[in-house]
Amino acid sequence: DTHKSEVAHRFKDLGEEHFKGLVLVAFSQYLQQCPFEEHVKLVNEVTEFAKTCVADESAENCDKSLHTLFGDKLCTVATLRETYGEMADCCAKQEPERNECFLQHKDDNPNLPPLVRPEVDVMCTAFHDNEATFLKKYLYEVARRHPYFYAPELLFFAARYKAAFAECCQAADKAACLLPKLDELRDEGKASSAKQRLKCASLQKFGDRAFKAWAVARLSQKFPKAEFAEVSKLVTDLTKVHTECCHGDLLECADDRADLAKYMCENQDSISSKLKECCDKPLLEKSHCLAEVENDEMPADLPSLAADYVESKDVCKNYAEAKDVFLGMFLYEYARRHPDYSVMLLLRLAKAYEATLEKCCAAADPHECYAKVFDEFQPLVEEPQNLVKQNCELFEQLGEYKFQNALLVRYTKKVPQVSTPTLVEVSRNLGKVGAKCCKLPEAKRMPCAEDYLSVVLNRLCVLHEKTPVSEKVTKCCTESLVNRRPCFSALELDEAYVPKAFNAETFTFHADMCTLSEKEKQVKKQTALVELVKHKPKATKEQLKGVMDNFAAFVEKCCKADDKEACFAEEGPKFVAASQAALA
């Protein structure tokens, strides 16, 4: 459905508030270093222009594409060359190359200061003084730090952010009301960003076939009563939504997401019995609720898959006539029967089935060749089951902090070339799988754990792509999306790695250590642990535990001392010497 003016169409569909929010997010995700005021100015100019187009769709420039309009606006920024360097060269290109160029320059790890949370009273004053600016600032700060954040979902986060301040700034104890809500939004926001980053990576690095396969598996688990045709329609629409958002087409993405939510709510009977409570909510909340909805109950008496996918005389005919549809049906049927499997496992099973048919349908006796295909699935199923079991046992034995440390050691030994901050960030997040998933019932553990690990490992892949240092990481990240986690799990100690020279400066600590939050202290200690392993990759668990216990004791002692700095200066070199001796 073509419109004379795309910008007028989107403004009318989305309404002014959402239009302005989405344009601010789009600009902030592209120009991550620009000051807030600059972005607000650009957004206001675009909004005024959109209003002229709503009034008269034939007005000058109203027929231009959104990429052309937005790109032209971004290219008016005066300091583009000084601030962004070669990104300024994008402005010499024509659409669609210019937008592709901007996309390629999105920075997953921008050099921005961590967000500092002001005092509650300061925040409440700012909220009351200018609510609109306060909320725009939130969108801007999150979007520039998370350039692939799912834009319509970010509007939902902003709505919750606003609600938290509206409620808590009236409360008797503002801090007790507000801080837990802000912590929850921060943690959920980071998780949402990471999940979306994996969706964009699968689309951009592996193509829409990979994303569609993921979506078929996930939606079939969620909506096991829906027919394959219904799931296919949802997958097609969802792929369009995410392709748009990942491509920077945020207005189209938000509009299409709203249409998808409307469709799902109008067709609940043929999708899922679990959608009712979502569909009564306002738009942003409704879309969020639908995305997070729990799995519907499986239909009773689903027949065995063997009849149609192994025993049927038509397996190879189906495979030859409509390869992707047939594999999609197989994946749908398997996934709706297995909410207890991770999506990644289901995709591996579909890949194994495809590989078997590819081989067997060219054989002299295809049926004889693929007759045992389901037996080949067993080791693929057992591998993540065992991994989850072992790691949950380890988590329960050690607790989160020490479990993270075990993973830090494990991953540093596998890929010691990776930067220490990246190893610390990724291993800490890998370690959070324990608290997140191990408490769940058996049937929910694997989907929780393995699909979460896929999200965390994607972060490693994204950071590593920016600064590649390890062929092993590149190989695991690029060879197969569904086998990334097994690929990393299978890595052993890197024998070719030349240990890092000892640097006393790395292990020198000061009194400021004592004023750090518990989390910051952990990060400091974990940073030291990674550096130790890089120095002595073959150190045993016992040796490393000894050094870390000594470290904790040394820090605790000096933080209790009257003259903390003097204690660190005196005890620090002793700790370093003792550690070197212990690891010799």
């Epitope: 027919e227 394959f228 045709a229 296919s232 689903l302 027949p303 009849a307 149609d308 049927s312 005389k313 038509d314 005919k317 189906n318 006539e321 409509a322 549809v325 047939f326 049906m329």
Partner: nanobody
Framework: QVQLIESGGGLVQAGGSLGLSCAAS????????AAWFRQAPGKEREFVAA???????TYADSVKGRFTISRDNAKSTVALQMNSLKPEDTAVYYC?????????????????WGQGTQVTVSS
């Protein structure tokens, strides 16, 4: 196994309409291709219409524009709406099904068959 039972046949005047229905049981068939075939006395069984998993329909040239095949997966039924009937449409109409992504047009491709229902068009 899939069991198919046709209903709706009968006697109708030329130019009239009739609706046939086929009820499937035994296992879910929403992803199966379903078809209607017919056999006039002393003639070969011939293809009439087929419908696949995503409701894409195909028709024999002789019935195009007059007959419509449809499916209701919630009820596990496949229907054939026949309009502008002609005496040469007189035959026993059979419902058939097979697990195929692309609906075949030849009878030998179908695994499951109903018993048939008689349609007679008088002039």
């Amino acid at each position: 196994q899939v069991q198919l039972i046709e209903s709706g046949g009968g006697l109708v005047q030329a130019g009239g309409s009739l609706g046939l229905s086929c009820a499937a049981s035994g296992r879910p068939v929403s992803n199966y291709a379903a078809a209607w075939f017919r056999q006039a006395p002393g003639k070969e069984r011939e293809f009439v219409a087929a419908i696949n998993w995503n409701k894409t329909a195909t028709y024999a040239d002789s019935v195009k524009g007059r007959f419509t095949i449809s499916r209701d997966n919630a009820k596990s039924t496949v229907a054939l709406q026949m309009n502008s009937l002609k005496p040469e449409d007189t035959a026993v109409y059979y419902c058939a099904a097979v697990f195929r992504v692309v609906a075949p047009k030849t009878q030998y491709d179908y695994d499951y068959w109903g018993q048939g229902t008689q349609v007679t068009v008088s002039s």
